[in-house]
Interface confidence: low
Amino acid sequence: EGICRNRVTNNVKDVTKLVANLPKDYMITLKYVPGMDVLPSHCWISEMVVQLSDSLTDLLDKFSNISEGLSNYSIIDKLVNIVDDLVECVKENSSKDLKKSFKSPEPRLFTPEEFFRIFNRSIDAFKDFVVASETSDCVVSSTLSPEKDSRVSVTKPFMLPPVA
Amino acid sequence: EGICRNRVTNNVKDVTKLVANLPKDYMITLKYVPGMDVLPSHCWISEMVVQLSDSLTDLLDKFSNISEGLSNYSIIDKLVNIVDDLVECVKENSSKDLKKSFKSPEPRLFTPEEFFRIFNRSIDAFKDFVVASETSDCVVSSTLSPEKDSRVSVTKPFMLPPVA
């Protein structure tokens, strides 16, 4: 079972509703971890959940808490709780299998669709997390073999491969 | 009863939910009718509903249509229908009591709270509309009747004379 997998709940299913309920041209700031698009998840996941937590907390502040039904506020609030749990879990496992990028995350603007694709991918990384056997694969190289990630475009590093 | 009053439905109540469900810092473009801030409603309402219709239609395009519950899409769709009804009503009454500004509306950016305050007040204007018995009060001018305007000086007329 992946590290922290038990912290991931079904609330993530609400993301689809949330994305549909946010303006398509609304921009969400996220400090994006360089290499997320080309490197294995253990290289960036510990940093990424911290940044997602910050961004989602900021996003939550942009909405009013209305009790009625599945509001954006209530969905984001659940997502914040999920990610905060993962942040705690990452701290507990930080000396084990999760690496920290030496490169500082860069603030970028993402549409809701792009942002929550990164979110979903990060959550999936916990579900599918496999213990790293070596550290060399956390170095970004321009000579990355096509077989390694044939779906990654290096011309637009912020465009992620589709999430399964 | 106010002109077009029968066209205004209770769907306006959804506005509160919609505003709470939009990011507070999201900016909505509206061509704001000059004079709305200083002149009575019958001077600008016919122009304003046309602009609100355009803005709401553009806003609708920013959301995905998800069938579940009261989504932003479904609420905005209802509001577009209300405003489009009022646009029709204005056309029917345009030669009667509603004035049209000479001055072109100016595109401005409004937060959701500000935008929907303008929307609500425009709807209220139809609910409370009283037939205009005179046209002079749609012009801010130092040549207005002395009883009303003996103490006022205008350096730059805010609006040109209204079109009948």
Epitope: - | E114, A125, V130, T155
Partner: antibody, heavy 115, light 105 residues
Amino acid sequence: LVESGGGLVQPGGSLRLSCAASGFTFSSYAMSWVRQAPGKGLEWVSAISGSGGSTYYADSVKGRFTISRDNSKNTLYLQMNSLRAEDTAVYYCARRDFFAHFDVWGQGTLVTVSS
Amino acid sequence: QMTQSPSSLSASVGDRVTITCRASQGIRGYLGWYQQKPGKAPKLLIYSASSLQSGVPSRFSGSGSGTDFTLTISSLQPEDFATYYCGEWLSMPYTFGQGTKVEIK
């Protein structure tokens, strides 16, 4: 809305009042100055449209007072020249809402014109 | 010109209080009511003659159209002792009534 710039001035003198706005999109609202002489009622003095393109004055201050605004600084101004004793009052800046007349007011600043 | 009456009145907590405002010419519904306490700025209570401003207690109500308008406080509370002004905004210049002072009996 927070006013400043009031004080004691001699007849014929000048003062410039400022009103700093926050918490709303300043450029979207017409603004006014309203004054209140000691123990008296409210008197509208001047107004300016949201863009600053149009200005309005009561006849009692016409030619002596100038209203202006700097939307980049979210600030409203009232330049008062050739002041008279009858201009002594608390000066309020007020936001002019679309339907709600003056819905937000500053705390006021006292202008005293006396020799 | 706006004429308010009475200029002052004395009332007790729980009383129903009515203040009237008359315009010298028709102003439709373009009238607001304000409350002012000593040393404080005016506060908008009612706009468009009868619409309650957000955050204002429901004991305040407004009515009227044209030339005659009324502000009613259904059950006077201790914090309601103040001076009340009507103001109109049909066109320039904006004008206010002379005020009605509501005092404790």
